[in-house]
Interface confidence: low
């Protein structure tokens, strides 16, 4: 048994006569043989659930659900109730109505086994019938809404008549009807004005009925019509088995370059026309089990369940449903030597589904784990300026497909064939598993015998120690020019284009800093700044070379304070800045300020 509403509303007036009928509460059956029996809670409650007093005024007919006044509520009783309401004015009281058999303990009042009946209290006697407006003669102040469980026996869930009005104003004729589309499952009995379902409802066909209740009032020669919404929501039960959309129960996947823990290898989607169990319970009640295969597969993969509500069209209206994505995920990094093919099965169980049939599906994942071979091109040829400063990035080496790698740890090393010409260094980029070549020794660059540098690049997979090799030929070009006196170590210090471009700084491939002119659009990623190379700095990312020395690119790497209009980078540097940003790495400070106007004519006039 369950209530068709969680709350009912009616008006109460001072000195309303004992025996006045107030309203009906309605219960619907979960099974055909059930017979409802109603029971009132012992107490009246006020604002903020304050227990006011034992209920001595209102009674219920246990079999019909009719609430009526057992005795009149007079001024003094109301005053006493008001005093107990924690000092708040007492405008509304409520009672709890329970469906027997339920526990006789009057605890929380939760639908479906309990409903609240709210009474708006008027500190006057019942108004004269002639003064009541049609709206007051027809409907309660609060619009009702109804909840009906799907697949349950049909029954009466509402009674239109306002009982106190009918009781006290017998000469006013009030008629009701429901405006509804063809074939809807509701009827309003013309004599009793009871609204009932004609048959069991199916939520998967229709979830909401937006009906309209029409009330016609006849008082003497006067006839008026009042219309109010009459919404019915169909509540779901787990009556739909999970299915495969388009019959797809198998996903095939190849694990090759993406071998990192938490990589999603494949996804299978399961559709369930139901929206129960609710989200809080869903993962506990909608289980997925990776069926025991070999131990390796059990350790290597896990299944993640990602449920999402969706809408599907049914009979011209949209109803909610659930899609469950089951993701096969790598549980650990896979070695590049791993090479196997397997079928994994996942048992999905909608444990609340009662049938007919089974609420169980078997998902199949066909997974091929391919080995990865390390290959480098036979030769790399690069050039470097003799003026390049330390940490200048001059190129990249990359094993085949390295941009696609994840979970593969490749380290690059350089072996120099000329002992005194170890000009370059290499560091591995965590982002794309490439090796970034940079100038490590500027003195060696200037030696005439180091005009051509020969290296062997060795790429090693850290887990398996597998290697690949390539020749690296570096040509040193141009002539060395000594640094201007008084230039800072970091390009980022310079605030103006002129001073920027006449100096070099750490990380500069040409021996000169480069000016990046911003777009001047407020706080922008494209702020003006001085950089060793605008290809790499600033780009919103502190790369593995830039981490070697804070002076290279503090715009990307500084962890200190940034003064002025800016948006901080995650986790460091300047993501966006206002005007021009310059930095003082030693002081761990950057400043973003409006662009300077450097017009000489203006300078003259301003004097």
């Amino acid at each position: 048994l369950y209530f068709s509403r969680d709350a009912y509303w009616e008006k109460l007036y001072v000195d309303q006569a004992a025996g006045t009928p107030l309203l009906y509460v309605h219960a619907l059956r979960d099974a055909p043989e059930e017979v409802p029996s109603f029971r009132l809670g012992q107490h009246l409650y006020g604002t903020y659930r304050t227990r006011l007093h034992e209920n001595n005024w209102i009674c219920i007919q246990e079999d019909t659900g009719l609430l009526y006044l057992n005795r009149s509520l007079d001024h003094s009783s109301w005053e006493k109730l008001s005093v107990r309401n924690r000092g708040f004015p007492l405008l509304t009281v409520y009672l709890k109505v329970f469906l027997s058999p339920t526990s006789l303990r009057e605890g929380e009042c939760q639908w479906p086994g309990c409903a609240r009946v709210y009474f708006s209290f008027f500190n006057t006697s019942f108004p004269a019938c002639s003064s009541l407006k049609p709206r007051e003669l027809c409907f309660p102040e609060t619009r009702p809404s109804f909840r009906i469980r799907e697949n349950r026996p049909p029954g009466t869930f509402h009674q239109f008549r306002l009982l106190p009005v009918q009781f006290l104003c017998p000469n006013i004729s009030v008629a009701y009807r429901l405006l509804e589309g063809e074939g809807l499952p509701f009827r309003c009995a013309p004599d009793s004005l009871e609204v009932s379902t004609r048959w069991a409802l199916d939520r998967e066909q229709r979830e909401k009925y937006e009906l309209v209740a029409v009330c016609t009032v006849h008082a003497g020669a006067r006839e008026e019509v009042v219309m109010v919404p009459f919404p019915v929501t169909v509540y779901d039960e787990d009556d739909s088995a999970p299915t495969f959309p388009a019959g797809v129960d198998t996903a095939s996947a190849v694990v090759e370059f993406k071998r990192k823990e938490d990589t999603v290898v494949a996804t299978l989607r399961v559709f369930d026309a139901d929206v129960v169990p609710a989200s809080g319970e869903l993962v506990r009640r909608y289980t997925s089990t990776l069926l025991p295969g070999d131990t390796w597969a059990q350790q290597t993969f896990r299944v993640e369940h990602w449920p999402n509500e969706t809408s599907v069209q049914a009979n011209g209206s949209f109803v909610r449903a659930t899609v469950h994505d089951y993701r096969l995920v790598l549980n650990r990094n896979l070695s590049i030597s791993e090479n196997r093919t397997m079928q994994l099965a996942v048992l999905v169980n909608d444990s609340d589904f009662q049938g007919p049939g089974a609420g169980v599906l078997l998902l199949h994942f066909n997974v091929s784990v391919l080995p990865v071979s390390l290959h480098l091109p036979s030769t790399y040829s690069l050039s470097v300026s003799r003026r390049a400063r330390r940490f200048a990035q001059i190129g990249k080496v990359c094993v085949e497909n390295c941009q696609a790698f994840s979970g593969i740890n490749v380290q690059y090393k350089l072996h120099s064939s000329g002992a005194n010409c170890s000009t370059l260094g290499v560091v591995t980029s965590a982002e794309d598993t490439s090796g970034i070549l940079f100038v490590n020794d500027t003195k060696a660059l200037r030696r005439p015998k180091c005009a051509e540098l020969h290296y062997m690049v060795v790429a090693t997979d850290q887990q398996t120690s597998r290697q690949a090799q390539a020749q690296l030929l570096v040509t040193v070009e141009g002539s060395y020019v000594a640094e201007e006196a008084g230039c800072p170590l970091s390009c980022a210090v310079s605030k103006r284009r002129l001073e920027c471009e006449e100096c070099g700084g750490l990380g500069s491939p040409t021996g000169r800093c480069e000016w990046r002119q911003g777009d001047g659009k407020g706080i922008t990623r494209n702020f003006s700044t001085c950089s060793p190379s605008t290809k790499t700095c600033p780009d919103g990312h502190c790369d593995v070379v830039e981490t070697q020395d804070i002076n290279i690119c503090p715009q990307d790497c500084l962890r200190g304070s940034i003064v002025g209009g800016h948006e901080p980078g995650e986790p460091r540097g300047i993501k966006a800045g206002y005007g021009t940003c310059n930095c003082f790495p030693e002081e761990e400070k950057c400043f973003c300020e409006p662009e300077d106007i450097q017009d000489p004519l203006c300078d003259e006039l301003c004097r």
């Epitope: 129960d249 397997m342 048992l347 169980v360 599906l361």
Partner: antibody, heavy 118, light 107 residues
Framework: EVQLVESGGALVQPGGSLRLSCAAS????????MTWVRQAPGMGLEWVSG????????FYADSVKGRFTISRDNSKNTLYLQMNSLRAEDTAVYYC???????????WGQGTLVTVSS | DIQLTQSPSFLSASVGDRVTITCWAS??????LAWYQQEPGKAPKVLIY???TLQSGVPSRFSGSGSGTEFTLTISSLQPEDFAPYYC?????????FGQGTKLEIK
């Protein structure tokens, strides 16, 4: 009660074709993978082919791959095995079996005899 | 494909005897192995699945053990109705395969 009833077995010439059917009842057919197993006279059991619950995935023994096709019609609760290019070594009793969720075969039909001979 | 080899191929024993049949897999099949009995003229029936779980309705004198590549089926006290061929089957990966069978005969 779970029941599996095979039909379609016959005497057929080498190179010929035959279609076996297996009518299922007593369980929700569309929820279970199904399989065909055969047994040559006086020999052991040989797994022939399997199909997933929806029919989206099919699996075959190497000895029949490219010649046999497994399929199912969930609306008719029926499993099929289309056998083409039949050879003398395909002579056997063919059983259809229901797979449990964990893969093993918990219910079997009574079998249907296929004889390939000239 | 995974090959299963049963030993012995033939076994003579008497009522009341304890007998053991072994099944070797050519590669790791975890515990994904089942044992079937086939009475003459009938379809096989499953005795043990998941290497050691007794199928409901099967007498407790049957038991299974093992994992990985070596598995055994033990009948603790032979009954007259137990004389039949027995097959192991791996369900670890497709194609599923059966052992060649062990024929248990009355001595």
């Amino acid at each position: 009660e779970v029941q599996l009833v095979e039909s379609g077995g016959a005497l057929v010439q080498p190179g010929g074709s035959l279609r076996l059917s297996c009518a299922a009842s007593g369980f929700t057919f569309s929820n279970y993978a199904m399989t065909w197993v055969r047994q040559a006279p006086g020999m052991g059991l040989e797994w022939v082919s399997g199909i997933s619950s929806s029919g989206a995935s099919t699996f075959y023994a190497d000895s029949v791959k490219g010649r046999f096709t497994i399929s199912r019609d969930n609306s008719k609760n029926t499993l099929y095995l289309q056998m083409n290019s039949l050879r003398a070594e395909d002579t056997a009793v063919y059983y259809c079996a229901k797979e449990d969720y964990w893969g093993w075969f918990d219910y079997w039909g009574q079998g249907t005899l296929v004889t390939v001979s000239s | 494909d995974i090959q299963l080899t049963q030993s012995p191929s033939f076994l003579s024993a008497s009522v009341g005897d304890r007998v053991t049949i072994t099944c070797w897999a050519s590669q790791d099949v975890s515990s994904y192995l089942a044992w079937y009995q086939q009475e003459p003229g009938k379809a096989p029936k499953v005795l043990i699945y998941d290497a050691s779980t007794l199928q409901s309705g099967v007498p407790s004198r049957f038991s299974g053990s093992g994992s990985g590549t070596e598995f055994t089926l033990t009948i603790s006290s032979l009954q007259p109705e137990d004389f039949a061929p027995y097959y192991c089957q791996q369900l670890n990966s497709y194609p599923y395969t059966f052992g060649q069978g062990t024929k248990l005969e009355i001595k």
